[in-house]
Interface confidence: medium
């Protein structure tokens, strides 16, 4: 298991919410991506190959997410100060073999300007 800080902008704020970007290499065909808050699994998405050109995307812990050919974005809404924490992208690579797990993360700072429902 490889642990490290994300070497890219992991948090993108908009409209009182945050997009958490979890990247993976383009070569990866089948994988599971989990979003961890501290040690707690918030979201997951699994992509697997099926018959012919079919692909299966499944989530056991569902969050609004977006999949591209080299990243999974998880969206958290209605930010408040309790969202401030360490967030990790836990990537399990199934294909190509060998099986590998990588963990990258960063700290989500919450500032007044990013809160969803600021008191005026």
């Amino acid at each position: 298991e490889i642990n490290g800080s994300a070497n890219y902008e992991m948090f993108i704020f908009h409209n009182g919410g945050v997009q958490i970007l979890c990247k993976y290499p383009d070569i990866v065909q089948q994988f599971k991506m989990q979003l961890l808050k501290g040690g707690q699994i918030l979201c997951d998405l699994t992509k697997t190959k099926g018959s012919g050109n079919t692909v299966s995307i499944k989530s056991l812990k569902f969050c609004h997410s977006q999949l591209s050919n080299n990243s999974v974005s998880f969206f958290l809404y209605n930010l408040d100060r309790s969202h401030a924490n360490y967030y990790f992208c836990n990537l399990s690579i199934f294909d190509p073999p060998p099986f590998k797990v990588t963990l990258t993360g960063g700290y989500l700072h919450i500032y007044e300007s990013q809160l969803c429902c600021q008191l005026k």
Partner: antibody, heavy 124, light 108 residues
Framework: EVQLVESGGGVVRPGGSLRLSCVAS????????MSWVRQAPGKGLEWVSG????????DYSDSVKGRFTISRDNAKNSLYLQMNSLRAEDTALYYC?????????????????WGQGILVTVSS | EIVLTQSPGTLSLSPGERATLSCRAS???????LAWYQQKRGQAPRLLIY???SRATGIPDRFSGDGSGTDFTLSISRLEPEDFAVYYC?????????FGPGTKVDIK
Amino acid sequence: EVQLVESGGGVVRPGGSLRLSCVASGVTFDDYGMSWVRQAPGKGLEWVSGINWNGGDTDYSDSVKGRFTISRDNAKNSLYLQMNSLRAEDTALYYCARDFYGSGSYYHVPFDYWGQGILVTVSS
Amino acid sequence: EIVLTQSPGTLSLSPGERATLSCRASQSVSRSYLAWYQQKRGQAPRLLIYGASSRATGIPDRFSGDGSGTDFTLSISRLEPEDFAVYYCHQYDMSPFTFGPGTKVDIK
């Protein structure tokens, strides 16, 4: 024990239609993609069509594209193959088969469980 | 589409002998997405090997697979009476999935 049981085969005239069904038991059906594979009498195996776990993605061999439709009903643990505009060359034993994910990972391989097959004969 | 060619077409051997079956692909099968199946008369195919070399659950260790790219082999170290059957290789890398024409292993 995983069991796949096909039904709906029979004799049909060229240009006719048939709907094959495959009922699965002993398995969490919606965990898996499924396929139809056929075998003409005395010949080899031919992959026909595949569908992912929730029916949201399908694929077909060129020989049946536009004529056959694969679908599934997870509530009924059932897989279907609607066959239209049938031709003599579609005569075969049709198997439903389950996609498999290797132990300890999701490394994909078809097909670890097969039905016993159902015969479709297209003849005038 | 990827065309698979199997050789020999028929292999006549005695129980206890070693069988080596070949499967050649018309283009590279990436990530070793190649499987082997055994089919006996009147029965559905049975998965033996996936990922070119991984044995499926319950398959005896006398069956082994090897190869990568375009050349793959299935070996049966000591033929048992129940091993006489037709063997198909199968690529599941590119759509449409394709099977080889089969190798029949029969008793000499």
